[in-house]
Interface confidence: low
């Protein structure tokens, strides 16, 4: 196995929920074999870890939800990479394996006595973020009847219940955003378009749907390319040169891409001096993420992106922005993140990182340049879904009993899945959370536009919406120049 | 987990090699959730199990190969299905998981003493046959540094060592047969072709290569469709109707398909009365398999297929054809197979199957209608590769020592992989077995043609070869009619 010792965030409880978040970026190509992950991530990583920990605290202090039952968690890092996520998922299922080892008489004590385990099994898993990774994790979890609720894995393939029975999500399938992207292309009469997608399930299936729908609408996808998110500069440059060769005819580039693929494209545009040459139409892997455009805003200007509608969660910020490294010890990645975020050394701390020369000032605060993860509402809704599913299961299996009755020891994954599929409740933003027969949720998208708002000031603005097949666009806003 | 209790074939030894063979057909769509497999298979299943058992006997009695070391095996059924194969692979790695559980103090005996395991870990895995399934298995095995040697998983994707480091194969990548198929299309000036592929890695990546190469050669792939091997009749009929709608222009149908997909197409042709309407060009998933055409020969006539060159292995037949259910007790599937093969009941036997009315006659023999698995040579070469890799590793780690020295206890998968990659030896058919930097083997294909040889007598005949980019075809043979 990898020599990397995997860090885990634990919270005790009567029932343990697993979670996979991309606490670190994916391994670079040369580090894939060691499964050595990249730098720590704030929005997709640390914020989601904290969302899990704090949401469980809120659930545990809610007397109407799972009374007399404490929810705990085991949070692991997926590094946005299949091999790492699979390795971590094996840790989730280890307990199931060992209990069946014992049944089969493969674990024996030297004196013939029985063994016991000191770790509670995982009843369900939240995440991971990436569709490709979620598929691999689901392939494993479903063998053990462990339900999985995703908060941002939107690939259409995951709707197939014959293949992914124990998979559910609080987000819609990408079939809908592919339709939205085609509707935007139609609206502006772009008949000749280049296409790029991220290698992997999210990009491939999304782009396939986009192409199929485009063909039906008479839109010519002139050239189509794919690239890995973690591809090297050379690969991105090569791709950009190909796209350049189709200018000016194919100025519009539809990108069904993960955020880091878009960032790779923007960086290549800078290297090749191609800012302003293309109009990018991006899927929700880009959405309104600043970590995609940071430092490459000029190249991104004009980009039109799809974003799942998810307002900021105020109570999360109230909690998160008070966190400090000397007190937040339950998050094992927090000190590493703090040093990375402020590029300083936590001198004298357990995880002091000597690569930073400057010592961290005690007046530092997360309020500085804070941006809440755009999928925060979905992460929280996924956790609440698991809680409501368990609550309904408890009500049905333990009528008139507060707490875990014998019928719920151990928790049967098949029954939990049934209960989860029937769950409906009011989500964190006031929207109804429910699941269709494929475990998918209904969805509504916002259409964003990345603009230069003033001299050297860039931002995403909302220029429209797509709701259940209906596209609304503020055309004047899309085509107006702000920086005058 | 599945309620199905999985059967395993064991052979004891100092070193245990795992193997995944499709002893049964894949689950039908309605049985996928239970992972309840289909009927027992002879060529792809039982013959491979017996090849493994007998090849290990030959290796163990060879004084020059691994002297003083006995190779044993643990053979599991993949059912040509990812979920089943993954479930079985988890059994292979169980031991690694448990040993690390103990290291981490997660397994304790009630009196505090230590526990011990009664099962040797698997050092490597042979198989499985399908590329899609092999990918899933590799994703898991590589986390535990367990080398995997495939005998028929030919997908191009598997050449990517950043993704599949512990994967090797004694067959070439499909990039080569895609090229061969394009060369055939070119040779006969078929400029307008329909395309079908099996959903899953083998079909998808193969068809992608076929399309890319076709485009470069100015061949128009008019329409392209995909279908699951285990899709229902309705799905196959729907696909055939689409193909029919492009007749007569797109008469040629290039099928980068697993054998059972081709069989599904032939069955749909029968239902829709489309025999003789298409000319099928099939990849090596079809090759010269009788289980593909059986009962649907008239629909398959004219089909041109690609087959990996692999002569029959005489010594295997000498062993296999003598097997009998009363004596062959080490193969736990043999009685089930015998009853299925001869459609009779082994009365009074442990695995007597009451669904058959007729009692098996003691004069039955496997010689009747015997066909050796077309991939037999590859299966055996894969097993020998593992043995030679271990032999070279032992020579290097235990110089001057016969048997397993301390440096090989336990066996380090990384070192074994290195040793395997450097392995070269004379294969079972006299060919050189070696691996390039991607773990791939060189390959040569035969071009087969399915013909009516006489009244109601059909067979595959060799009509050409493709060797390292050079296509040779006996055009007269391809277009001649035999049944006159």
């Amino acid at each position: 196995q990898s020599s990397e010792r995997r860090v885990v965030a634990h919270m005790p409880g009567d029932i343990i929920i697993g979670a996979l978040f991309s606490v670190h970026h994916q391994p670079t190509v040369d580090k894939v074999h060691e499964r050595k992950c990249g730098a720590v991530r704030e929005q997709y990583g640390i914020q989601r870890v904290e969302a899990m920990l704090h949401t469980l605290e809120r659930i545990n202090s809610d007397p109407t939800l799972l009374p007399n039952i404490t929810l705990g968690c085991e949070i692991r890092d997926s590094c946005w990479h299949s091999a790492v996520a699979l390795e971590q998922s094996i840790e989730f299922i280890r307990d199931s394996l060992i209990s069946s080892e014992e049944e089969e008489g493969l674990v024996r004590c030297v004196d013939g006595s029985s063994s016991f385990r000191s770790k509670k099994p995982i009843v369900g898993v939240i995440g991971p973020g990436s569709s490709s990774v979620a598929i691999q994790v689901q392939n494993l979890l479903q063998l053990f009847n462990i339900p999985q609720i995703a908060y941002s894995a939107t690939s259409m393939d995951l709707s197939d219940k014959t293949l992914f029975k124990y998979f559910m999500r609080v987000v819609p399938s990408d079939a809908q955003q592919a339709r939205a992207m085609v509707d935007i292309v139609k609206r502006y009469n772009w008949t000749y378009v280049s296409a790029v997608h991220t290698e992997g399930n999210y990009g491939e299936s999304g782009m396939e749907a986009f192409k199929d729908m485009s063909a039906k609408e008479g839109i010519c996808i002139a050239h189509s390319y794919k690239i890995y998110s973690n591809a090297g500069e050379q690969s991105f440059d090569k791709l950009l040169k190909k796209l350049r060769s189709h200018l000016p005819k194919a100025r519009v580039v539809a990108c069904f891409c993960e955020g880091m693929t878009v960032r790779g494209l923007l960086m290549a545009m800078r290297r090749l001096g191609l800012a302003g040459e293309f109009l990018l139409l991006g899927s929700d892997g880009w959405a309104d993420r600043y970590d995609v455009t940071d430092g490459y805003q000029r190249e991104a200007v004009g980009g039109i992106t799809i974003k799942l509608q998810s307002p900021d969660v105020k109570w999360f910020d109230d909690y998160y922005l008070k966190l400090r490294p000397e007190t937040n010890l339950r998050n094992p990645w927090f000190q590493e993140f703090w040093q990375h975020r402020f590029q300083c050394r936590l001198e004298g701390f357990a995880q002091e990182n000597s690569k930073y020369n400057k010592t961290c000032n005690s007046s530092l605060t997360l309020r500085t340049h804070h941006v809440q993860d755009s999928k925060m509402g979905f992460v929280i809704n996924a956790i609440y879904s698991m809680a409501y599913g368990l609550h309904n299961m408890q009500m049905s299996l333990c009528p008139g009993y507060a707490g875990l009755c014998d019928a719920m020891k151990p928790i049967d994954g098949r029954k939990l899945l049934d209960s989860l599929m029937k769950t409906n409740f009011t989500g964190v933003s006031g929207d109804m959370i429910l699941f269709d027969e494929n475990g998918d949720s209904p969805g509504r998208y916002e259409i964003m536009n990345f603009k230069e708002m003033g001299k050297d000031y860039f931002d995403y603005i909302n220029v429209g919406s797509w709701d259940n097949g209906e596209l609304k666009m503020d055309d004047d806003e899309v085509w107006s120049k702000k920086n005058n | 987990q599945s309620s199905e209790r999985r059967v395993v074939a064991h052979m004891p030894g100092d070193i245990i090699i795992g193997a995944l063979f499709s002893v049964h057909h894949q689950p039908t769509v309605d049985k996928v959730h239970e992972r309840k497999c289909g009927a027992v298979r002879e060529q792809y299943g039982i013959q491979r199990v017996e090849a493994m058992l007998h090849t290990l006997e030959r290796i163990n009695s060879d004084p020059t190969l691994l002297p003083n070391i006995t190779l044993g095996c643990e053979i599991r059924d993949s059912c040509w299905h990812s979920a089943v194969a993954l479930e079985q692979s988890i059994e292979f790695i169980r031991d690694s998981l448990i040993s690390s559980e103990e290291e981490e103090g997660l397994v304790r005996c009630v009196d505090g003493s230590s526990s011990f395991r009664s099962k040797k870990p698997i050092v490597g895995v042979i198989g499985p046959g399908s590329s899609s399934v092999a990918i899933q298995v590799q994703n898991l095995l590589q986390l535990f540094n367990i080398p995997q040697i495939a005998y028929s998983a030919t997908s191009m994707d598997l050449s990517d060592k950043t993704l599949f480091k512990y994967f090797m194969r004694v067959v070439p990548s499909d990039a080569q047969q895609a090229r061969a198929m394009v060369d055939i299309v070119k040779r006969y000036n078929w400029t307008y072709v329909s395309a079908v592929h099996t959903e899953g890695n083998y079909g998808e990546s193969g068809m992608e290569a076929f399309k890319d190469m076709s485009a470069k050669e100015g061949i128009c792939i008019a329409h392209s469709y995909k279908i699951y091997s285990n899709a229902g009749e309705q799905s196959f009929d729907k696909l055939l109707k689409k193909l029919r709608s492009h007749l007569p222009k797109a008469r040629v149908v290039a099928c980068f398909c697993e054998g059972m997909t081709v069989r599904g197409l032939l069955m749909a042709m029968r239902r829709l009365g489309l025999a003789g309407e298409f000319l099928l060009l099939g990849s090596d998933g079809w090759a010269d398999r009788y289980d593909v055409t059986d009962g649907y020969q008239r629909e398959a006539v004219g089909g041109i297929t690609i087959k990996l060159q692999s002569p029959d292995v005489k010594w295997f037949d000498d062993y296999y054809l003598k097997l009998r259910p009363e004596t062959n007790l080490r193969n736990p599937w043999f009685q089930e197979f015998w009853q299925h093969r001869f459609q009779c009941r082994l009365e009074g036997f442990a695995q007597e199957n009451s669904k058959y009315n007729k009692t098996c006659n003691s004069s039955l023999t496997l010689r009747t209608h015997h066909v050796q698995d077309s991939k037999m040579g590859f299966v055996i070469n894969a097993i020998y590769s593992m043995a030679y890799g271990l032999h070279n590793m032992q020579m290097s780690l235990c110089p001057g020592y016969a048997g397993l020295c301390d440096a090989m206890k336990p066996i380090d998968g990384r070192k074994l992989l290195d040793s395997l990659m450097k392995t070269n030896f004379t294969g079972v058919s006299g060919d050189m077995i070696l691996f390039d930097e991607n773990g791939d083997s060189p390959g040569r294909y035969e071009i087969m043609n399915f013909k009516e040889m006489g009244k109601d007598y059909f067979d595959y005949i060799n009509v050409g070869s493709w060797d390292n980019g050079e296509l040779k075809m006996d055009d007269d043979e391809v277009w001649s009619k035999k049944n006159n």
């Epitope: - | 020579m395 290097s396 110089p399 001057g400 020592y401 301390d406 440096a407």
Partner: antibody, heavy 120, light 109 residues
Framework: QQQLEESGGGLVKPGGTLTLTCKAS?????????MCWVRQAPGKGLEWIAC???????TYYASWAKGRFTISKTSSTTVTLQMTSLTAADTATYFC?????????????WGQGTLVTVSS | DIVMTQTPASVEAAVGGTVTIKCQAS??????LAWYQQKPGQPPKLLIY???NLESGVPSRFKGSGSGTEFTLTISDLECADAATYYC???????????FGGGTEVVVK
Amino acid sequence: QQQLEESGGGLVKPGGTLTLTCKASGIDFSGYYYMCWVRQAPGKGLEWIACVYTGDGGTYYASWAKGRFTISKTSSTTVTLQMTSLTAADTATYFCARGSGVGSYGYNLWGQGTLVTVSS
Amino acid sequence: DIVMTQTPASVEAAVGGTVTIKCQASESIYSNLAWYQQKPGQPPKLLIYRASNLESGVPSRFKGSGSGTEFTLTISDLECADAATYYCQGYYAITTTNAFGGGTEVVVK
């Protein structure tokens, strides 16, 4: 009985080249061993230089020895150590030793050593 | 490269007594450590390999222990013939290199 004998030592000028030979008797290298060179400056400790695997002639060097020293298996019973650009610091008794590995099993058979003196 | 630090440089003990020599590796070398005895004008003689395994023909009075970075050679029931210089040799598997300690001179009174 099994023994190793070093030869080729002597006086050499700074900047010079010298080749030492280790001859094994009672040992057939086809048994696959690691033949190594270790040196010891007068009154000082031992210093590992290099090993060669008699199976395939694979070599293993101390980082300081790479480039200037070359170990080779020259026949089924001899191993050589070629030394170039010699300086006074290379003055030492050079021992030939045999092990079952590059180092993890130690060296269980040693020659008596040959003295190399680098001096003008 | 790996560095082996041996202590003490010299030790004196009476016949029948016990001597302990320590060897520290700059990196973890697991159990890849050997101990040698060298007498003037002679080549070294292997005593212990793999940290604690006694070479055949070596008296059981010689005992090796330790793993990782800290190792010990203990000689009990000292005899006059044990007067010699003792060296540890560490093997660093990752770089396939060896290093010897500086040696410990044992004087037997």
